[in-house]
């Protein structure tokens, strides 16, 4: 009863496409609407102003790529109002393969302001002709046996790639730099032992900056056998931090791997000194090995990727790492900390990427351990922060395909430069129910602590009711299931729980209320469940049918967001997505009436 | 029994108050100042207050069955039941199921043609004769058809590089065809040579990820009865695969966000619109298969048996068999699964409004009884041995006249149930004798109903 159905306003820009309304996000005094494309049409973002009643397409200045996936992923940071929009459809060919990852855009406060752009989980293409230079450390800190292991590693790589389109060169660096053999030498004599036979350990400093510039300008030269059409790759092998400074702008077109080995890289700070030499993301291009022994295991990661089609991979091998990650298929932001889902990572076992503030680097977090049964689980299909007043928050991530049953993993964010840790697993109970396909954290009493985790299973199949929302409450040892919500009977395929969102307090009792969308209950419906101390009311206070709002509507309730007063009338408004439209519903004013009765005679 | 009443001023309102409520139609039953609602109470209470038994109105729910002896082999009886339902009081009737011998069978073989099924395809090509022979051991009228599937032809389900769309198989495997979602190859036929010939022309294909688009294909097989050639007989759908399946929600990875509409979209025997619609959900498919009386047999490799067993919990009339790595045991598997399916009988009804509740008591031939279940269920049902289900139907309020059907899942016979309200009180005084009401009204179940402008117990 708290939302006024009669005064609903509909926004539907011309030519917006049927998926306008797939995502809705209240920002400032307007609503951002995602409109992924269909067929060959690209996706768009629209900004709808409540005052004017119009929606205008958002221009992503500086972005030269848009796929039909744009509009699928929108998130806002409740702490500072910044907006993250991702397009998980950045596809490109690499040899005979097609890679698929995401493009993300971060806006501070509004879509007109400055925009940061990043490519989370971007996999570089190493294809066709590859010219590879080994740049190896010859400083005095290397013991003779360690230096020999570096030489053995290089020989191993060259031998294994001898009948391919790879060409090699090698440069030793210390205080100065020496080309041990160039590409022409390699072409003349493809014998790694002979090519590295006369290497003399330099035993001086570690001038890494200068060495990289030397390779970029003095080794990748056509007259020395470098091929103009080849992909340039540089593998830097070092055991210590640089003893010089400067920049490596000359090497920006070279794919740069850096391998840091040994005791000098035990701290996070020392490891991070290597990041500036490597391509991004560091998670892929910086390799830290504690012993020189481990060099020989590294080769598999540097080999050319050939897609293994279904049916030809060995059970224990991962065919796909990040090539088809679909990074950015989900996203969430809290306190300036952005994460995006990457369902396709590690053979679709999935995971998520922890993005650095400038979006230029990321760290992948996935299933640990990576066993065969987690494959095709789609972890990262949903991600949602569960903020806490204490220092570290939890992140919930859904894997709705896990074993075809679905599960949700809870992770604790790193403390003081540590690592992410998986702290809880919650399993779905019905095959195909898409348990974890929607997640929502609720801070019922608005004290800064997330008390409830709502897990949607929109494809749950019941005799009369389709879809469920499972309510988990934070307890001492984690989140525990306390109850479940379901829609009205008569809709076995209604997809109750496809959208779940915490609203502002719309009934005036000081507690947060929750809206749940069921877009396939006839033309769609939205349920309101009021907050109550320690949880949610099990019965909806209101069920709004799409047809009550607008005749001919479809998929009403596919997305919902209601955290702001868009009208400036002091009443909270709720944005609801439907097929090719977005509806704004206003809440009704709440009046407290106090009745005093007296009887005479008493 | 009890009678909880609220603001009752007529016999009908009394009857609607609950199954324990009865109405006293005796004249002058109420004393001065008594409200009419005291006429509404439990039978013992009314008798105690001096209401004669034949003055107590207590309409009861009842069932009238009628047989329809037209047509041949009927496995369900009766064919028609009429129920008169008083709110809150169940009407019960019995349904008998007698499994017939040699019931006709249509079997559609739906096969995963992703690359890992290469050796399976080679064996299935040789199956036609064996498959039809196996069916003819069970029935005088068996037919077989064939279809195949791979997956949606968008990233990341298949490699969309042009060369790989032409030939998705590794090492430029020559006996390879472009990927496709579902291809209907052979309409149901009793010609085993035709099966051999047409299936013989199939080539393997390939995709990227492990799960396949089998649910897309199953939906089309269920949604396209004319194209597939289903008759109104036992419909078996053999689903052969060595891996899992995509379902609703997965399409998002390929920017396919439109829910599956459950309709037939075959053009030139291909599901060409698979890239427009998401995969069906498991529930949606279960719904569609039941609606079309199709019983799936999941022929899957050992690694996948547990997964597909969970699927059979959602799809009521379905079975799982373990497929050898090269599908060489598939005929044996189908025979076993058919025996399992045909010896288990589920009695169920179509969707009902909230106002009607149906429960089943199953009295199975092996002495097992299940009571108050949402559907009837007997296992180990033998040919020509009748089993009985007691069906109880309750209305929660005075309903509109309507009907629903009960059927044995996987069979074509139905019981039509017509439902009528039993809410009226047939009181003997419903004449238009106005004298008892001072000529200013008429008597209805012991109460004067006054003309406008008059009130009082006798419209005085």
């Amino acid at each position: 009863y708290n939302l006024d159905v009669r005064g609903a306003r509909s926004f539907s820009p011309p030519r917006a496409g049927r998926h306008f309304g797939y995502r809705v996000l209240q920002v400032g005094n307007g609503v951002i609407v995602g409109a992924p494309g269909e067929g060959n049409s690209t996706g768009s973002l629209y900004q709808c102003q409540s005052g004017t009643g119009h929606c205008l397409p958002v221009t992503l200045r500086g972005s030269n790529y848009t796929s039909k996936y744009l509009g699928m992923t929108l998130a806002t940071d409740p702490t500072d109002g910044s907006i993250l929009a991702c397009d998980p459809g950045l596809s490109r060919t690499c040899d005979q393969n097609t890679y698929l990852s995401g493009l993300c855009y971060l806006f501070r406060q509004n879509l007109q302001g400055p925009m940061l752009q990043g490519r989370p989980g971007f996999q570089e293409c190493i294809k066709g002709n590859v010219d590879l230079v080994f740049l190896f450390d010859g400083s005095m800190s290397l013991q003779p046996d360690e230096f020999q292991k570096i030489l053995d590693f290089m020989k191993d790589v060259m031998k294994k790639l001898s009948n391919t389109s790879y060409q090699f060169a090698a440069v030793q660096f210390s205080t100065s730099y020496k080309t041990e053999f160039d590409f022409s030498d390699y072409v003349k004599r493809k014998d790694p032992d002979a090519l590295l036979k006369h290497v003399k350990h330099m035993l001086l400093l570690t001038n890494t900056f200068g060495a990289i510039n030397y390779v970029a300008t003095e080794v990748f030269r056509e007259e020395l056998g470098a091929r103009p059409d080849a992909t340039k790759v540089l593998i830097i092998i070092t055991d210590g931090e640089a003893t010089d400074s400067g920049n490596i702008d000359a090497a920006k077109d070279i794919i740069r791997y850096i391998i840091g080995i040994g005791k000098h890289f035990q701290t996070k700070e020392s490891q991070e000194t290597l990041h500036k030499f490597a391509s991004k993301p560091a998670s892929e291009f910086v390799k830290i090995l504690d012993t020189f022994e481990k060099l020989k295991d590294l080769f598999t990661e540097l080999q050319k990727k050939i897609y293994v089609i279904e049916g030809t991979s060995k059970q224990d091998l991962t065919s796909f790492n990040m090539e088809l990650s679909s990074s950015g298929i989900s996203a969430d932001l809290s306190r300036g900390h952005a994460v995006v889902g990457a369902v396709g990572a590690k053979d679709w076992a999935g995971g998520f990427l922890d993005l650095k503030a400038d979006l230029q680097d990321d760290t992948f977090i996935g299933n640990e351990p990576l066993t065969p049964e987690v494959r095709a689980g789609y972890l990262g299909y949903t991600v949602t922060w569960l903020p806490s007043r204490q220092k570290t928050s939890l992140l919930a991530s859904g894997a709705p395909r896990y074993q075809h049953m679905g599960r949700v993993l809870l992770f604790q964010e790193p403390q003081g430069g540590g690592h992410w840790s998986q702290v809880q697993t919650i399993h779905g109970t019905q095959i195909g129910s898409y348990f974890g396909g929607e997640l929502c954290g609720v801070d019922v009493d608005q004290d800064g602590e997330t008390e409830l985790l709502l897990i949607g299973a929109p494809l749950f199949y019941g005799e009369q009711r389709g879809g469920r929302v499972f309510i988990y409450q934070r307890r001492q040892l984690g989140f525990e299931e306390v109850s479940e919500l379901q829609g009205d009977p008569g809709y076995p395929l209604g997809r109750f729980g496809e959208a779940i969102t915490a609203l502002t307090d719309i009934n005036g009792d000081g507690l947060v209320d929750v809206a749940v969308g069921a877009p396939l209950e006839e033309q769609g419906a939205v349920y309101i469940f009021n907050g109550r101390h320690g949880g949610l009311s099990p019965q909806p206070s209101q069920r709004i049918e799409g047809t009550q709002v607008l005749s001919g509507i479809q998929w009403f309730g596919r997305s919902i967001h209601g955290v702001k007063d868009l009208e400036g009338d002091g009443l909270a408004d709720v944005a609801v997505g439907a097929e090719s439209q977005m509806i704004v519903l206003s809440s009704r004013p709440v009046v407290d009436m106090v009745t005093l009765m007296s009887f005479s005679p008493a | 029994q009890e009678c909880t009443k609220f603001k009752v001023s007529s016999c009908r309102e009394c009857i609607e108050s609950g199954p324990g409520c009865t109405w006293c139609q005796k004249l002058n039953f109420t004393g001065p100042g008594d409200p009419d609602s005291i006429r509404c109470d439990t039978r013992p209470q009314l008798l105690m207050r001096g209401c004669a038994a034949d003055d107590i109105m207590d309409p009861t729910s009842l069932a009238e069955t009628q047989e329809d002896h037209n047509g041949g082999q009927k496995q369900l009886s009766p064919q028609k039941v009429t129920l008169y339902l008083r709110p809150g009081q169940a009407a019960a009737f019995n349904v008998t199921f007698r499994r017939a011998k040699g019931y006709p069978i249509d079997l559609y073989y739906l096969m995963d043609l992703s690359y890992s099924m290469l050796d399976d395809l080679r064996n299935v090509k040789k199956l036609g004769g064996d498959l039809l022979r196996a069916l003819n051991e069970i029935t005088e009228s068996g037919r077989i058809g064939f279809g195949s599937f791979v997956d949606k032809t968008v990233l990341p389900f298949v490699n969309t590089h042009p060369d790989k769309l032409r030939n998705p198989c590794p090492n430029k495997e020559k006996e390879c065809q472009p990927p496709f979602a579902f291809r209907h190859v052979l309409k149901l036929t009793n010609n085993s040579n035709q099966f051999q010939t047409e299936v013989g022309k199939q080539l393997i294909s390939g995709n990227l990820d492990a799960p396949e688009g089998g649910l897309d294909a199953m939906m089309q097989v269920a949604a396209c009865p004319e194209e597939i050639g289903w008759r109104n007989v036992t419909r078996l759908l053999v689903f052969a695969t060595d891996d899992g399946f995509h379902f609703a929600g997965d399409g998002k990875l390929g920017a396919i966000l439109t829910p599956n509409d459950g309709r037939c979209h075959l053009e030139d025997n291909l599901y060409k619109r698979s890239n427009e619609f998401d995969y069906p959900s498991v529930g949606q498919l279960a719904h569609k298969l039941a609606e079309n009386n199709i019983q799936p047999i999941f022929a899957v490799t050992s690694r996948m048996v547990k997964t597909y067993e969970k699927l059979t919990e959602i799809i009521p009339k379905s079975a799982v068999g373990e497929l050898s790595e090269d599908s060489s045991n598939v005929v044996h598997l189908i025979k076993n699964a058919y025996n399992k399916l045909s010896s288990r009988v589920f009695l169920d009804h179509n969707a009902l409004p909230d106002t009607l509740k149906v429960t089943y008591d199953s009295f199975c031939s092996n002495g097992v009884t299940h009571r108050n279940q949402p559907r009837g269920d007997c296992d180990g049902v033998q040919i020509n041995v009748p089993i009985t289900f007691q069906v109880k139907v309750t209305a929660t309020e005075c309903i509109q006249e309507q009907s629903f059907v009960i059927r044995a899942l996987g069979f074509t016979d139905i019981v039509t149930v017509q439902v009528l309200p039993q809410c009226e009180c047939r009181c003997r005084d419903q004449s238009r004798d106005r004298s008892l009401c001072h000529g200013k009204g008429f008597l209805e179940c012991g109460i004067c109903r006054c003309d406008t402008g008059y009130i009082g117990k006798n419209c005085e």
């Epitope: - | 290469l118 080679r122 090509k125 040789k126 006996e175």
Partner: antibody
């Protein structure tokens, strides 16, 4: 490397019999459909017999049906053609050819052929 | 049986010129999106060699001057620029229906 070597060709009188063999190597013989194709001197190609990978399905054109029998021994990687009631028009170079793993399709590898001459 | 007819028994082309050899089937050889038509080259004293399978797929190791096209009943083998070593007899073959049948062959000669 895939290799097919035919043997057994000879001069035979009309009405006589002969058995041709084909030794296969360099591939998994039991995976493939195999065939015999003949070519009469100065003439075109004619398929005379085909067999599937496990010997369960066999096909002949009407010209040789009832007279020729194709068989295989997968343990020996060998294909055979038993020819009875030979006629002058059966005189030809007989090729053993490999077909696909899934069906009788194209012939991707051929032997060098063995010559059968039927003459009195 | 499906009868395969190659329109010309012989064809003379100058070196470097384009050669086109056609083949017609008495009924369609298309099934399920594939054309089951194949082309072979046979040089004197040698067995036939597969050039093109399923109408347009180039067999590995065959120079890309050879290409195939067509569907249904009409098919063409094209040699974009004839070389001396291409002198041979070319056969088409269908495998859509048993029995598998060959065309009578087209002999390519240099003008």
């Amino acid at each position: 490397d895939v290799k097919l070597v035919e043997s057994g060709g000879d001069l035979v009188k009309p009405g006589g019999s002969l058995k041709l063999s084909c030794a296969a190597s360099g591939f998994t013989f039991s995976d493939y459909y195999m065939s015999w194709v003949r070519q009469a001197p100065g003439k075109g190609l004619e398929l005379v017999a085909a067999i599937d990978n496990d010997g369960g399905s066999i096909s002949y054109p009407d010209t040789v049906k009832g007279r020729f029998t194709i068989s295989r021994d997968n343990s020996k990687n060998t294909l055979y053609l038993q020819m009875n009631s030979l006629r002058a028009e059966d005189t030809a170079l007989y090729y053993c050819a490999r077909q696909g793993r899934l069906r009788r399709d194209y012939f991707d590898y051929w032997g060098q052929g063995t010559l059968l001459t039927v003459s009195s | 049986d499906i009868v395969m007819t190659q329109s010309s028994n012989s064809l003379a082309v100058s070196l470097g010129e384009r050669a086109t050899i056609s083949c017609r089937a008495s009924e369609s050889v298309d099934s399920y999106g594939n054309s089951f038509m194949h082309w072979y080259q046979q040089k004197p004293g040698q067995p036939p060699k597969l050039l093109i399978y399923r109408a347009s797929n180039l067999e590995s190791g065959i120079p890309d001057r050879f290409s195939g096209s067509g569907s249904g009943t009409d098919f063409t083998l094209t040699i974009s620029s004839v070389e001396a070593e291409d002198v041979a007899t070319y056969y088409c073959q269908q495998s859509n229906e048993d029995p598998l049948t060959f065309g009578q062959g087209t002999k390519l000669e240099i003008k």
